[in-house]
Amino acid sequence: MAVTACQGLGFVVSLIGIAGIIAATCMDQWSTQDLYNNPVTAVFNYQGLWRSCVRESSGFTECRGYFTLLGLPAMLQAVRALMIVGIVLGAIGLLVSIFALKCIRIGSMEDSAKANMTLTSGIMFIVSGLCAIAGVSVFANMLVTNFWMSTANMYTGMGGMVQTVQTRYTFGAALFVGWVAGGLTLIGGVMMCIACRGLAPEETNYKAVSYHASGHSVAYKPGGFKASTGFGSNTKNKKIYDGGARTEDEVQSYPSKHDYV
């Protein structure tokens, strides 16, 4: 029962997370105009991964897509790639996890197959979440770097001229959506991996031994009850799970930087 709940909750959390990653990727507000120097601007600029927008006081909003591919910064391309990889892995993970759900019966699928599918989807969710977190963090780092560079230019590169005010950009809503969504997908993936341990049918480690008492013939099977709990020592399943954990650790080496302006 606890395993089913863990698996179901992992699936739901991952589903929410992936929906968030998709939303963040599509959002236009990855970076928004910093209003510190001009809080009463009548023209507000904001940018996404795919287009940049301008919203006027009049209510008129104009968005222009980045129609060039080669002219875009390599970092932006990298962030796009990370987010798309995250979405694709997450979508495949969701598809796999639907069939792996214990509450859903598909033909005569064995529990061991469901356990493997649960683990696979869990790992996919973990990598998906890490891709999203890495993508958002790379973009945030890029913003912080550009912010301080433009601040330095504002005060040192003017040469006495104060006619042009350089537009500085700060963190947009999409970054926070991305971080939270990536985190949820990661958590969902971990929950799926945990659920996998309890899903696999246990092999008993001891053969049934017959003990002959005087005048009575009773067959006592140690490990019989233990096997049904799902938490017994199972080297085969443990090996699979450890492999998954190792993959998780490897993927977690992605750079993650949360700099607030």
């Epitope: 023209v43 006081s57 209510g59």
Partner: antibody, heavy 118, light 113 residues
Amino acid sequence: EVQLLESGGGLVQPGGSLRLSCAASGFTFSSYTMSWVRQAPGKGLEWVATIIIGGSYTYYADSVKGRFTISRDNSKNTLYLQMNSLRAEDTAVYYCTRLVKGNAMDYWGQGTLVTVSS
Amino acid sequence: DIVMTQSPDSLAVSLGERATINCKSSQSLLNSGNQKNYLSWYQQKPGQPPKLLIYWASTRESGVPDRFSGSGSGTDFTLTISSLQAEDVAVYYCQNDYSYPFTFGQGTKLEIK
């Protein structure tokens, strides 16, 4: 046809109050940012205040800040300008305007004259 | 605040001739996000409210004759009337639409020579 009709102007003593209204018709009032612009007799144009579409943001000229309040009633298609602590220098024709692309003012009312004098 | 300065204060041009009015802003009105200049031009005839001629520094408002054109970028802008007509006699104002407070130039009075 777009129409903006100001009312509420008149003669008022210094320190007094007045409320200007602007009745809008011929367009979806709630979908536009609106402004008040004034023109002192024989002088140039001076922007007074702006209220954004939803009414959540308002902006004022430094000369009227703290004394004037811009508001709108989208259900009545009406823009207001509450003027308190009036001064002689507030004497002007007050125009109600609609903001469009480029934050430009494409339609202007005929104006209402406010005279502050003792 | 952005200060708008128009020149000349008054201008007399013969009918059919070109009229040029300049407007200078104390800060750039060019928005980097869309590469548009937030400046508009208005025409005001005696006893009438102002009329929008140009927005985004060079985009003509619908219904405005094509003899009116706007140009310039950053801090320097120009309104040009290619062939002056009698009905063009008015006061012309430029306006900063980029940041609050919105500010107008002092106006240029255009007359027929």
